[in-house]
Amino acid sequence: MAVTACQGLGFVVSLIGIAGIIAATCMDQWSTQDLYNNPVTAVFNYQGLWRSCVRESSGFTECRGYFTLLGLPAMLQAVRALMIVGIVLGAIGLLVSIFALKCIRIGSMEDSAKANMTLTSGIMFIVSGLCAIAGVSVFANMLVTNFWMSTANMYTGMGGMVQTVQTRYTFGAALFVGWVAGGLTLIGGVMMCIACRGLAPEETNYKAVSYHASGHSVAYKPGGFKASTGFGSNTKNKKIYDGGARTEDEVQSYPSKHDYV
């Protein structure tokens, strides 16, 4: 039961995380105008990965897409790439994990195949989450660098009384959405990998040794279960318990083996 719960929860957490990564990537508020001493502004600027926007106090908002590819900073291109790779990997991971879910039956899919798929989707989620966290962090670092640079030249004199106040940008909501979403996807991926260990079939190709005791005879299989990752021999999960005897290891470590018949 615990494996099913871990796998199901991992799937749901990853699903929320990937939805968050998609949302963050599409959001316009990656960087927002720093309002420092001026909490109410007549013109408010904010920027995303795909377009920049201006909101006037009149309520009018105008957004302009970045219609150039070569003219954009390399860092912005890198962030875009990281976020897209994260979304693609996450989407593939979700697709794979749907078929890997224990609660979903697809033909006569073996446990080893489900274990493999669970591990694959888990790794995909981990990489997806890392891509999102990396993308958001790179953008945040770019903002911090630019922030201090523009603070250094905050007021540039233009002769006499004329001043140009430079617009500084600070962290936008999308950065926090991205960090949280990346973290959730990462956690979901780890949960899927943990669930995979519980799903993996055991090696059962031991020879049973018969011990004849006085009274009644019981056939024991010596030794506990050998943990398998599912990448070794493709042993089918068939166990015969004579007399219903079970080892302590089996009961504690692998309760999920008896979740279904």
């Epitope: 007549a42 013109v43 009149s58 001043q163 140009t164 106040v165």
Partner: antibody, heavy 118, light 113 residues
């Protein structure tokens, strides 16, 4: 077509307060800021502040904080400005205006003349 | 606060002549986010409220005759009337629409010879 109708001229005593109104029609009142502007022969046009009728948010020119109070009643599509502790310097024409692209004021009321007597 | 300085304070021209008036701001009114200048021009005739002529420094409001042209960027702006008409006699104000508090110039009074 949007239209702003302001209340009539006021003659008030020094030290008293006055409340003028600005009734909006022809547009969704709660969706646009209503700004107030003071005009005197000496000082020209001065921006007092604005109110967003949708949620009652206000933003004042520091010079008029404590002097002017902006309110709005969405049920009657009316904005109000109260000026307290009147002095001769408050004698002016007060306009209400609705904002537009570029934070400009496209629709204006006809103005309310306030005369402060000693 | 941003200070708006208009010049000249008054000017007299013959009908049909081209006229220009200047407006200078103490801070740049150019917004880097959309490359627009937040400067507005108004026309006010005696006994009337101001009338919007131009916003974003050069965008003419609908219904405003095309003889009115706004130009300039940053801190220096100009309103030009290509051929002055009798109905153009008024006071012209420029306004900072970029930073609170919004501020107006003292105005340029246009008179006819």
């Amino acid at each position: 077509q949007a239209y702003l109708q302001q209340s009539g001229a006021e003659l008030v005593r020094s030290g008293a307060s006055v409340k003028m109104s600005c009734k909006a029609s022809g547009y969704t009142f709660s969706s646009h800021n209503i700004h107030w502007v003071k005009q005197t022969p000496g000082q020209g046009l001065e921006w007092i502040g604005y109110i967003y009728p949708g949620n009652g948010d206000t933003n004042y020119n520091q010079k008029f904080k404590g002097k002017a109070t902006l309110t709005a009643d969405t049920s009657s599509s009316t904005a109000y400005m109260q000026i307290s502790s009147l002095t001769s310097e408050d004698s002016a024409v007060y306009f209400c205006a609705r904002d537009y692209y570029g934070n400009s004021f496209v629709y204006w009321g006809q103005g309310t003349l306030v005369t402060v007597s000693a | 606060d941003i200070v708006m300085i208009q010049s000249p304070s008054s000017l007299t021209e013959k009908a049909g002549e081209k006229v220009s008036m200047s407006c200078k701001s103490s801070q740049s009114l150019l917004n880097s986010g959309n490359q627009k200048n937040y400067l507005t021009w108004y026309q006010q005739k005696p006994g009337q409220p101001p009338k919007l002529l131009i916003y974003w420094a050069s965008t003419r409001e609908s219904g405003v005759p095309d003889r009115f042209t706004g130009s300039g960027s940053g801190t220096d702006f100009t309103l030009t009337i290509s051929s002055v008409q009798a109905e153009d006699l008024a006071v012209y104000y420029c306004q900072n629409a970029y930073r609170f508090p919004f501020t107006f110039g003292a105005g340029t009074k246009l008179e006819l010879k």
